[in-house]
Amino acid sequence: MAVTACQGLGFVVSLIGIAGIIAATCMDQWSTQDLYNNPVTAVFNYQGLWRSCVRESSGFTECRGYFTLLGLPAMLQAVRALMIVGIVLGAIGLLVSIFALKCIRIGSMEDSAKANMTLTSGIMFIVSGLCAIAGVSVFANMLVTNFWMSTANMYTGMGGMVQTVQTRYTFGAALFVGWVAGGLTLIGGVMMCIACRGLAPEETNYKAVSYHASGHSVAYKPGGFKASTGFGSNTKNKKIYDGGARTEDEVQSYPSKHDYV
């Protein structure tokens, strides 16, 4: 029950996180005009990953897309790439995790397969969250650098008479949405990985049936495979048949949870 709850919660948290990553990526307010200690202008500038906008006091907002690809800063391209990778991984992760949910029955899917899929989606969510956090952090770092650079020469005087005000940009709402969303996706991914451990059964100990030969204490299997002495041998990834005499544990062979790490 706890496993199902953990898996379900992980899925929901990741879903919210990925929705947030998509929202942040589409938002126009990645950077907004810094209003502190600035002359009061009747125009408010803000920029996103895909376009820049200007909101006039009179009520008009005009947005212009970045129609160039080669002319854009490499850092902006990198942030775009990170966010898109995050969204794609997250979307695939969501798709995989839907089928992995313990509460959803799809044919005769084994718990081992569900555990495997849960782990896969969990890892995808973790990478997706990290991509979003990295993308937002790279953009934030870019803003901080540009902010202090523009502060250094905020007023570029022309003969001391005419002044040009340089627009400084600070963190926009999208950055905070991105950080929170990335964090949620990451947490959701961790929860899925934890749920995977509960879904996968404990390591199967295939109990060999001993055929005691006189004077030997070594268990033999038909087919020429030599089993290790005693019981509880780790038959990692090998299904050993005992010629029809098998214990209850061996009716179905489960992969070890460590096989998919």
Epitope: V40, T41, A42, V43, V54, E56
Partner: antibody, heavy 117, light 113 residues
Framework: QVQLKESGPGLVAPSETLSITCTVS????????VQWVRQPPGKGLEWLGA???????NYNSALMSRLTISKDNSKSQVSLKMSSVTAADTAIYYC???????????WGQGTLVTVSS | DIVMTQSPSSLAVSLGERATMNCKSS????????????LTWYQQKPGQPPKLLIY???TRESGVPDRFSGSGSGTDFTLTISSVQAEDLAVYYC?????????FGQGTKLEIK
């Protein structure tokens, strides 16, 4: 079509408060801002202030202490109040709608306010 | 506050001639976000309220004859009437629409020779 009409007292005694109402039609005050401009007889234009769609206001720094601009969206009315008036405040007062580039694209006909005892 | 200086204060031209008036601001009115200059030109005929001619320094308001054109960027702006008509007799004002408080120039009076 867009229309703005100012209505004022015409005559105000010195040190009193001047109150003018601008009634608009053809557009919504929740979408567009309204600006106020005055013109003393035979002189140039002077920007007084503005109230924007969101309700935020900006004022002429020289008159800020005496000016108050407010609006009633439901009545489509914007009001300008100026306290402690003097003869220097005698002017034609215009209200105008904010347009592209924060320019004033539609103007009222103006109302002449004379400050005299 | 931003100071707007218009020159000349009055201008006399013959009908059909070209009229050019200037406006200078104490600070750049260019917004880096959209590369637009927030300077507006108004025309005021005697006994009438002002009329919007040009916004964003060079964009003509709808219904304004194409003989009116605006140019300039940053701090220096020009209003040109390519062929002056009798109905163009008016005072022309430039306005800073970028920094609060918005400020007007003192006006240029266009007279017919």
């Amino acid at each position: 079509q867009v229309q703005l009409k100012e209505s004022g007292p015409g005559l105000v005694a010195p040190s009193e408060t001047l109150s003018i109402t601008c009634t608009v039609s053809g557009f919504s005050l929740t979408t567009y801002g309204v600006q106020w401009v005055r013109q003393p007889p035979g002189k140039g234009l002077e920007w007084l202030g503005a109230i924007w769609a969101g309700g935020n206001t900006n004022y002429n720094s020289a008159l800020m202490s005496r000016l108050t601009i407010s609006k009633d969206n439901s009545k489509s009315q914007v009001s300008l109040k100026m306290s402690s008036v003097t003869a220097a405040d005698t002017a034609i007062y215009y209200c105008a709608k904010g347009g592209y580039g924060n320019a004033m694209d539609y103007w009222g006909q103006g109302t002449l306010v004379t400050v005299s005892s | 506050d931003i100071v707007m200086t218009q020159s000349p204060s009055s201008l006399a031209v013959s009908l059909g001639e070209r009229a050019t008036m200037n406006c200078k601001s104490s600070q750049s009115l260019l917004n880096s976000g959209n590369q637009k200059n927030y300077l507006t030109w108004y025309q005021q005929k005697p006994g009438q309220p002002p009329k919007l001619l040009i916004y964003w320094a060079s964009t003509r308001e709808s219904g304004v004859p194409d003989r009116f054109s605006g140019s300039g960027s940053g701090t220096d702006f020009t209003l040109t009437i390519s062929s002056v008509q009798a109905e163009d007799l008016a005072v022309y004002y430039c306005q800073n629409d970028y920094f609060f408080p918005f400020t007007f120039g003192q006006g240029t009076k266009l007279e017919i020779k």
